[in-house]
Amino acid sequence: VPQKPKVSLNPPWNRIFKGENVTLTCNGNNFFEVSSTKWFHNGSLSEETNSSLNIVNAKFEDSGEYKCQHQQVNESEPVYLEVFSDWLLLQASAEVVMEGQPLFLRCHGWRNWDVYKVIYYKDGEALKYWYENHNISITNATVEDSGTYYCTGKVWQLDYESEPLNITVIKAPREKYWLQ
């Protein structure tokens, strides 16, 4: 049975600033690189037929659901892209994480401007601070890491706060063992 294709992002963030670039790639088993990929944005078929969909100079209209399909194989699970205009944007490697998997958080400054005194918060409590911008890395996520995250920082000497982001860590499914 052919596997469903999977959409991956490069850079890996599904929340980006207006004007930034992101490449969506339709990955699957033994798919030909010829023009055989269908891309769907908010349900509408895109003109792009390559296995990669490049979003250059992102606009707000680029926000939404993306799916891909190779030949007549099942559609991929959807990936949701959101385009923002703000001073700070909290980006996560994933918003739903399987327990035991890594989780990375990034407090991204508009136009890649320097951000100082960056503090990450979880459920309203400070998680970690540093004098310059820095990332948060959780090697093995646990259910306790679920929560609402945001970051604050200084850009051009002024204080800003990102929009909050809900992160959910789900328990890994139990392996099923069948007695012979």
């Epitope: 005194k117 970690k128 540093w130 004098y131 310059e132």
Partner: antibody, heavy 120, light 111 residues
Framework: EVQLVQSGAEVKKPGESLKISCKGS????????IGWVRQMPGKGLEWMGI????????RYSPSFQGQVTISADKSMSSAYLQWNSLKASDTAMYYC?????????????WGQGTTVTVSS | QSALTQPASVSGSPGQSITISCVGT?????????VSWYQQHPGRAPKLIIY???RRPSEISNRFSASKSGNTASLTISGLQAEDEADYYC??????????VFGTRTKVTVL
């Protein structure tokens, strides 16, 4: 009262190992960076390294990288400075100090210092 | 990472003002608004007197003030008093891997 209390003075021989401690109280120990500072007799302050007890993220001064190990134990609200093989040149006063917090720059709470003497 | 450069000694009479300089580079003092100042009396632990270039902890006298221009930070002690006689150190952020580097030490003498 916010304070850092350091372990007592140590007299050691060259080649011996040592671990000194710094216990925090009166604040959320895991939420502030803790730095270590060396002061050799009659000399100035030298920054050695810093640790965030919340996740044990550690940064070392290039001068001390590989010479010492900085660690922390959340359950004990303590930070540690360790040597595997002491040298006579390690004779100094060692201070731990807490960062101001919130990304503000400075060390606002200091331990009383631990005197380490290394002599054969 | 080289230490920041401070004058070895500065002196003044009671009631006078003195200024201690702390010279860095465009990669530390010149780049970041992260400078702190410490006072150390003989046999005592250092004490924070200025953080974030100009900010004073609440318990520190307003006779202590600080500023920064280019690659140089300065600490001014006004209305000099006998208890101000001590060693003074500046510190600056240099990089994420080396956040603290101290100055060379200035001995303040009250004449």
């Amino acid at each position: 009262e916010v304070q850092l209390v350091q372990s007592g003075a140590e007299v050691k021989k060259p080649g011996e190992s040592l671990k000194i401690s710094c216990k925090g109280s009166g604040y959320s120990f895991t939420s502030y960076w803790i730095g270590w500072v060396r002061q050799m007799p009659g000399k100035g302050l030298e920054w050695m390294g810093i640790i965030y007890p919340g996740d044990s993220d550690t940064r070392y001064s290039p001068s001390f990288q590989g010479q010492v190990t900085i660690s922390a134990d959340k359950s004990m609200s303590s930070a540690y400075l360790q040597w595997n093989s002491l040298k006579a040149s390690d004779t100094a006063m060692y201070y731990c100090a807490r960062d101001v917090g919130n990304g503000d720059y400075g060390l606002d709470v200091w331990g009383q210092g631990t005197t380490v003497t290394v002599s054969s | 990472q080289s230490a920041l450069t401070q004058p070895a000694s500065v002196s003044g009479s009671p009631g006078q003002s003195i200024t201690i300089s702390c010279v860095g580079t465009s990669g530390d003092i010149g780049r970041f608004n992260y400078v702190s100042w410490y006072q150390q009396h003989p046999g005592r632990a250092p004490k924070l007197i200025i953080y974030d270039v100009t900010r004073r902890p609440s318990e520190i006298s307003n006779r202590f003030s600080a500023s920064k221009s280019g690659n140089t930070a300065s600490l001014t002690i006004s209305g000099l008093q006998a208890e101000d006689e001590a060693d003074y150190y500046c510190s600056s952020y240099t990089s994420s891997s080396t956040p603290y580097v101290f100055g060379t030490r200035t001995k303040v003498t009250v004449l």
